[in-house]
C-alpha cells in the first residue's frame, strides 16, 4: 500500500490520528520537507538574539545578535560580546591590543602590524590598536644613492601616533 | 490594548507624508508591526512590517517608495513619490503569536492623494 | 509574486446554512494562510492562521483547511453578524528582504 504520507507537503505533518491526513504544522513548529510525520518545534530568538526572520510553516526562524554582540557559528548559533575596534576579546573581557598589534573590527582578534621591511619598504604611516601601518616606497626609492640597509623608521607608540 | 493610526491627510501627488501608529498596553519589540491599506471599495494591500528584532521587510511594490521604522511605543510609515493610486485608508496591526499576521487592528487613517 | 485567487466573489446562504470560501496559492506556502472578516467601516479580524489554527475569541463555527496551493474557510450554522467580506492571505518570504504578504480578492457573504 502507497504511504500516503509522501504526498503531505512542506509545512504540514502526516497525521496519523486522522487516517494520514496532512496537517498544517501548528503555531511555532515547521516541516521543510514533505512526508513528514511531526513538525519540528521553531527556533526562539531571545535574550541576546533577536528575530531576523519569523517561523514560518516551512522553515526555521533566523535570529541575529542583538546590539553589542555579533554573530558566531552556523546560523548564528552563539552571540559573542563585540569589543571596540583596538580591542580583542579575551576571556576575561575586551582587551587592548598588545603594542605591535592591531584590530580594525569590532570582532575578532588582534593582528601584527605589517612588516614593511620585508617587502623592501619603509613605514609610511606608523601602526595604531585600531589600524595597520602603512608601507611607502622602499627607502632606495625615497633617496636615490641611499644604501639599501638603511632601516625603515621605526613604529611608535600607538598611544604617541599623530592623529 | 490597542493601535491607532494618525497623520492621514489630503496631499498632492509627489508629497511626502509620514503617518504614525501609537500603541498602548503592549511592547512594540516584542511583535511584528504591520501596515496594509485599503482603497476606497477595494481589498487589502499588504505594504510591509517591522519585526520584533526590529528588521523590515516590504512588499515588492513598496520596497523602496515606503519606510518604516519604530520607537519604543510608534511605528511609522514614511512614504514618498504619492500618486493619486495611494489614495487609501491605511491601517496598522500587531501581529499574532511571533508572526506577520494582523491581529489587533487600528481603526484606520485616510489618506487622499488628489491634484 | 504569489497570486491568491479566491473563489467565489460572492455567495449568499440563509440563516443556519452553510458557506465555503475556497483559496489558490499559485505556489506553494505550506500551510502560511490566515482569513479574515471585514465589516463596512471596520478594519479586518483575524479568524484563523496557518491554515486551521482559530484566532483568540473567534467561533468554532469557523473552521480552516487545506495546504500547499489549496486552502478552505467553511462557516456553518450561519448567522446575520456573519455577513462581511472575508479575505484569505498567504505568508510567503522572498528574496532580498521582499514578502509576499499577498491578499485574495475577498468574498463578499450575504446572509439571507
Known amino acids: 500500500l502507497q504511504d500516503l504520507c509522501s504526498n503531505c507537503p512542506a509545512g504540514t505533518f502526516c497525521d496519523n490520528n486522522r487516517s494520514q491526513i496532512c496537517s498544517p504544522c501548528p503555531p511555532n513548529s515547521f516541516s521543510s520537507a514533505g512526508g513528514q510525520r511531526t513538525c519540528d518545534i521553531c527556533r526562539q530568538c531571545k535574550g541576546v538574539f533577536k528575530t531576523r526572520k519569523e517561523c514560518s510553516s516551512t522553515s526555521n526562524a533566523e535570529c541575529d545578535c542583538i546590539s553589542g554582540y555579533h554573530c558566531l557559528g552556523a546560523e548564528c548559533s552563539m552571540c559573542e560580546q563585540d569589543c571596540k575596534q583596538g580591542q580583542e576579546l579575551t576571556k576575561k573581557g575586551c582587551k587592548d591590543c598588545c603594542f605591535g598589534t592591531f584590530n580594525d573590527q569590532k570582532r575578532g582578534i588582534c593582528r601584527p602590524w605589517t612588516n614593511c621591511s620585508l617587502d623592501g619598504k619603509s613605514v609610511l604611516v606608523n601602526g595604531t590598536k585600531e589600524r595597520d601601518v602603512v608601507c611607502g616606497p622602499s627607502p632606495a626609492d625615497l633617496s636615490p644613492g641611499a644604501s639599501s640597509a638603511t632601516p625603515p623608521a621605526p613604529a611608535r607608540e600607538p598611544g604617541h601616533s599623530p592623529q | 490594548q490597542s493601535v491607532e493610526e494618525s497623520g492621514g491627510r489630503l496631499v498632492t501627488p509627489g508629497t511626502p507624508l509620514t503617518l504614525t501608529c501609537t500603541v498602548s498596553g503592549f511592547t512594540i519589540n516584542s511583535y511584528h508591526m504591520i501596515w496594509v491599506r485599503q482603497a476606497p471599495g477595494e481589498g487589502l494591500e499588504y505594504i510591509g512590517f517591522?519585526?520584533?528584532?526590529?528588521f523590515t521587510y516590504y512588499a515588492s511594490w513598496a520596497k523602496g517608495r515606503f519606510i518604516i521604522s519604530r520607537t519604543s511605543t510608534t511605528v511609522d510609515l514614511k512614504m514618498t513619490s504619492l500618486t493619486v493610486a495611494d489614495t487609501a485608508t491605511y491601517f496598522c496591526?500587531?501581529?499574532?503569536?511571533?508572526?506577520?499576521?494582523?491581529?489587533?487592528w487600528g481603526p484606520g487613517t485616510l489618506v487622499t492623494v488628489s491634484s | 509574486d504569489v497570486v491568491m485567487t479566491q473563489t467565489p466573489a460572492s455567495v449568499s446562504e440563509p440563516v443556519g446554512g452553510a458557506v465555503t470560501i475556497k483559496c489558490q496559492a499559485s505556489q506553494s506556502i505550506g500551510s502560511d494562510l490566515a482569513w479574515y472578516q471585514q465589516k463596512p467601516g471596520q478594519p479586518p479580524k483575524l479568524l484563523i492562521y496557518r491554515a486551521s489554527t482559530l484566532a483568540s475569541g473567534v467561533s468554532s463555527r469557523f473552521k480552516g483547511s487545506g495546504s500547499g496551493t489549496e486552502f478552505t474557510l467553511t462557516i456553518s450554522d450561519l448567522e446575520c453578524a456573519d455577513a462581511a467580506t472575508y479575505y484569505c492571505?498567504?505568508?510567503?518570504?522572498?528574496?532580498?528582504?521582499?514578502?509576499?504578504?499577498?491578499f485574495g480578492g475577498g468574498t463578499e457573504v450575504v446572509v439571507k
Open positions: 496591526a500587531r501581529g499574532v503569536d511571533g508572526t506577520s499576521y494582523p491581529d489587533l
Open positions: 517591522i519585526n520584533d528584532g526590529g
Open positions: 492571505q498567504c505568508i510567503y518570504y522572498g528574496s532580498d528582504d521582499v514578502i509576499y504578504h499577498t
